[in-house]
Interface confidence: low
Amino acid sequence: AWELTILHTNDVHSRLEQTSEDSSKCVNASRCMGGVARLFTKVQQIRRAEPNVLLLDAGDQYQGTIWFTVYKGAEVAHFMNALRYDAMALGNHEFDNGVEGLIEPLLKEAKFPILSANIKAKGPLASQISGLYLPYKVLPVGDEVVGIVGYTSKETPFLSNPGTNLVFEDEITALQPEVDKLKTLNVNKIIALGHSGFEMDKLIAQKVRGVDVVVGGHSNTFLYTGNPPSKEVPAGKYPFIVTSDDGRKVPVVQAYAFGKYLGYLKIEFDERGNVISSHGNPILLNSSIPEDPSIKADINKWRIKLDNYSTQELGKTIVYLDGSSQSCRFRECNMGNLICDAMINNNLRHTDEMFWNHVSMCILNGGGIRSPIDERNNGTITWENLAAVLPFGGTFDLVQLKGSTLKKAFEHSVHRYGQSTGEFLQVGGIHVVYDLSRKPGDRVVKLDVLCTKCRVPSYDPLKMDEVYKVILPNFLANGGDGFQMIKDELLRHDSGDQDINVVSTYISKMKVIYPAVEGRIKFSTGSH
């Protein structure tokens, strides 16, 4: 028997520095977790102790903090090289700055293979990107070889900016011929490494003949065997075992997100490359693991540019940006309108001639807007200003919901109106009218939504049984502020871009902003 140790990360999302337990900015260093310096300590410890070790990343290193905003992927290449990753799969967020924003900082600089079997380049891009990413890579490990085959969510064109010269194929259809090719090369130990979410990971384990292990990402799935060491609740045991259509037991793993854990999977293969046993658990990278001094020093050196950036002007406002609680928790506020407009703008993807855009709606809990911005400071808006407005380090995500769920969400928005509670919704692409004289649960008297399948966008009444795409904070997608109906009833959830980054990009693009209160949210009494 031959033993392989797979160390894996996924959805690190720009958390190069250690973070608090909830993966936001580190406040109390003695309680902080993760970060590349701490990750390196643990990886090195395992590399010294065990003979056959692979360090893999399942995508979405890009996007999530000011590190990505400033360094645009150069930081990912630099620190992944320093940690000596063996391979990485492309995630949807690797395309956030377009194909150029992937090629220049990461594909050309990475000293490790970057993989995806289901992304096919066409047109002029085909020659430009040729060889910079691969469908698979055969890696020597000790006396053996291991094949790593990559995959990426086929939803990427809706979630990021890959452009028109990359085709995202069905994962299973694309993976099978690559695995077959590896078999013809006498590679009998094959890992599928990719970024399509836990449900697809399990399908790959079931359907793709010849895949021995699946290492996934995208859904931020936490798996654990035994008592979990922190706040994350396991979605299943680690590894999660799938019985393939041809009767094999295939371990599937993921390691939550944000570099909080290092996935640790030990696989025993027989001489024919069959998995005899698999066991392990994610390792919580808490403060009991010291940060590596040399990586930490490097991080501190790179940090200097971030501090300078946060005080530079992004753009100007010529109006007061009212982010006060007494506005945003009680009525339409122009800060809410600005943020929602930025959220929609960040999700413009012209993928179908029938649709002007794939999504037109935004909802945003008023309690998530934490500060106004005064226009009398020369109108200057800085990253620092935006960090006061959006201090929680969340993301703006894409969900699919039925109209009936949206109606429940808007009823919840005003079910205890007047108490300055955070659930009051700010909106974009939605016109809502409330009648507060009616009993809670029956206060939404009009709810119109902006069409997407139209050349001239206009507002139509919400249809209860129709499925709509909505951009919202991850806090709401996870049921925060009492929006349990969103969490329970959502049909799809894809994590998006860092909230501050979305708004800062929009302001930089617009240069001068003047959001108004324009009647998106109205109140009526009696008949309207």
Epitope: S24, N28, R31, S325, Q326, G367, S420
Partner: antibody, heavy 119, light 106 residues
Framework: QVTLRESGPALVKPTQTLTLTCTFS??????????VGWIRQPPGKALEWLAH???????YYNPSLKSRLTISKDTSKNQVVLTMTNMDPVDTATYYC???????????WGQGTLVTVSS | DIQMTQSPSSLSASVGDRVTITCRAS??????VAWYQQKPGKAPKVLIY???YRYSGVPSRFSGSGSGTDFTLTISSLQPEDFATYFC????????FGQGTKLEIK
């Protein structure tokens, strides 16, 4: 329902360190948006905000007293602890802990504990 | 820091009177102001937040108004239980309180 209770010494000597504990129930400091603050009131005088801790361990202090104050929390025990160094007779006051709403007004208060600084 | 100057510092009135207490902030605090009532030996109780919003359970005779730097707490018809000390508080920057207004029976 929400309750808060302050505990600590009734008498401290000048230059000593005061440690006060706020034990609360009816809410959890691990819930997003929750916070607990400390406010004091010298006899017959106005209220003065001292410090505040959020659910995510973010801490804020009154700038004029910052060097003397430390606030911490033990989420599992539902407690928040305030320490104040180098006590002086002018620090004689009733010390209150209060739950801070998502912005910074205080809806729920403890009954207060009178601390006298005297040799 | 932001000073909150309350006036008057004391006030005598009778049951049924309309009473107004004012608070002036040393700089613009928008509507980030709360009002509290405190009785001897007791903790303060919030009456008004965000300058004009009555906290749940507070009688409708209490109302607040103002924005920017000038704020008012009004008791439309004094009741016996209203005789107490009233404090304003701003929370636009770190919280600061007014020095209090003692409302006594005439």
């Amino acid at each position: 329902q929400v309750t808060l209770r302050e505990s600590g010494p009734a008498l401290v000597k000048p230059t000593q360190t005061l440690t006060l504990t706020c034990t609360f129930s009816g809410f959890s400091l691990s819930t997003s948006g929750m916070g607990v603050g400390w406010i004091r009131q010298p006899p017959g005088k106005a209220l003065e905000w001292l410090a505040h801790i959020w659910w995510d361990d973010d801490k804020y202090y009154n700038p004029s007293l910052k060097s003397r104050l430390t606030i911490s929390k033990d989420t599992s025990k539902n407690q928040v602890v305030l320490t104040m160094t180098n006590m002086d007779p002018v620090d004689t006051a009733t010390y209150y802990c209060a739950r801070r709403e998502r912005w910074a007004w205080f809806a729920y208060w403890g009954q207060g504990t009178l601390v006298t600084v005297s040799s | 820091d932001i000073q909150m100057t309350q006036s008057p510092s004391s006030l005598s009135a009778s049951v049924g009177d309309r009473v107004t207490i004012t608070c002036r902030a040393s700089q613009n605090v928008f509507t980030n102001v709360a009002w509290y009532q405190q009785k001897p030996g007791k903790a303060p109780k919030v009456l008004i937040y965000s300058a004009s919003y009555r906290y749940s359970g507070v009688p409708s005779r209490f109302s607040g108004s103002g924005s920017g730097t000038d704020f008012t707490l009004t008791i439309s018809s004094l009741q016996p239980e209203d005789f107490a000390t009233y404090f304003c508080q701003q929370y636009n920057s770190y919280p600061t309180f007014g020095q209090g207004t003692k409302l006594e029976i005439k």
